[in-house]
């Protein structure tokens, strides 16, 4: 347990062993705009059944679609992709040292789960948790995009805030996005409140992911640091 | 393995109407989705629609949304293309084509494992 209570959810096992690769020899580009700063991005996706499992793809693709925008290696952005329910399962970790084209083709496996419940507070006490519990790369900014489309029982909220503000006190940045009539707009309000950087974007529905996926990823993008340059030797 | 069969294309006048079908048969009970796909000579395969097995929810390419709709009978194994307000450019050959998991993005043709064998479109002006 963690001081203060809270019950430390078991470590999810590696997907798949990891598979080293050059880092320099890097894939090139796939648009003019390419987010190269040093950033730690976690996906977390609703699994209920608020999305349909066609909605639920789109969900994915926009996934894919921001991680073609980003400059993803182990030296600038490391993503991580989390699906939750009533618990969460990890499909990439933010350590895992594999190509982006691959890490792409683990984004678009994710299952659709199709739970009664999607715990908004299961998922932030995992990425407090098991994503951030050690920070081994302080000089990144930290991001946890939140992509909510559901409400959970309010049994389930009731550390939920707690979580939030254990995220604040690591630096994790929390932007939510609420996705279409069912997103839980106090939760969003709640996790805005905590700091100004913890942006929302809220949605009618998954529809208008990919007009405002420029936008999302200009933000998250803005909010970290670029590299600083390679010092010379005297 | 799943075996799918089209039919229903044909030659028809721009502002005309056509509806495809695409019947499963074989391991139809690990289907996930049934989509339909479009390919004119010298290029690779357009997504056009899909249609989830489990929730009957569906997705279109922006080409055709609005005037194209994809519907299924569960009875029948039976997936169906109506496509209203045709156009010269639709002219194409239309494959049917399944998907036993949620792997891959659902409008790249990578992610389905069987396909029909195709049938021909054409809208002439």
């Known amino acids: 347990q963690e001081p203060g209570g809270l019950v430390v959810p078991p470590t999810d096992a590696p997907v798949s062993p990891t598979t080293l690769y050059v880092e320099d020899i890097s894939e090139p580009p796939l648009h003019d705009f390419y987010c190269s700063r040093l950033l730690d991005l976690v996906f977390l996706l609703d699994g209920s059944s608020r999305l349909s499992e066609a909605e639920f793809e789109v969900l994915k693709a926009f996934v894919v679609d921001m991680m073609e925008r980003l400059r993803i290696s182990q030296k600038w952005v490391r993503v991580a992709v989390v699906e939750y329910h009533d618990g969460s399962h990890a499909y990439i970790g933010l350590k895992d040292r594999k190509r982006p084209s691959e890490l792409r083709r683990i984004a678009s496996q994710v299952k659709y789960a199709g739970s009664q419940v999607a715990s908004t507070s299961e998922v932030l006490k995992y990425t407090l948790f098991q994503i951030f519990s050690k920070i081994d790369r302080p000089e990144a900014s930290r991001i946890a995009l939140l992509l909510m489309a559901s409400q959970e029982p309010q049994r389930m909220s009731r550390n939920f805030v707690r979580y939030v503000q254990g995220l604040k006190k690591k630096k994790v940045i929390v932007i939510p996005v609420g996705i279409g009539p069912h997103a839980n707009l106090k939760q969003i309000r709640l996790i805005e409140k905590q700091a100004p950087e913890n942006k929302a974007f809220v949605l009618s529905s998954v529809d208008e992911l990919e007009q405002q996926r420029d936008e999302i990823v200009s933000y998250l993008c803005d909010l970290a640091p670029e590299a600083p340059p390679p010092t010379l030797p005297p | 393995q799943v075996q799918l069969v089209e039919s229903g294309g044909g030659l028809v006048q721009a502002g005309g109407s056509l509806r495809l079908s695409c019947t499963a048969s074989?391991?139809?009970?690990?289907?996930?989705?049934l989509g339909w796909f479009r390919q004119v000579p010298g290029k690779g395969r357009e997504f056009i629609a899909v249609?989830?097995?489990?929730?009957?929810?569906?997705l279109y390419s922006d080409s055709v949304k609005g005037r194209f709709t994809i519907s299924k009978d569960n009875a029948k194994n039976t997936v169906y293309l109506q496509m209203n307000s045709l156009k010269p450019e639709d002219t194409a050959v239309y494959y049917c084509?399944?998907?036993?998991?949620?792997?891959?993005?659902?409008?790249?043709?990578?992610?389905?494992?069987?396909w029909g064998q195709g049938t021909q479109v054409t809208v002439s002006s």
């Open positions: 249609i989830y097995w489990r929730d009957g929810s569906s």
């Open positions: 084509a399944n998907r036993h998991d949620s792997r891959g993005t659902y409008y790249s043709s990578r992610g389905y494992d069987y």
């Open positions: 074989g391991r139809t009970f690990s289907t996930y989705a």
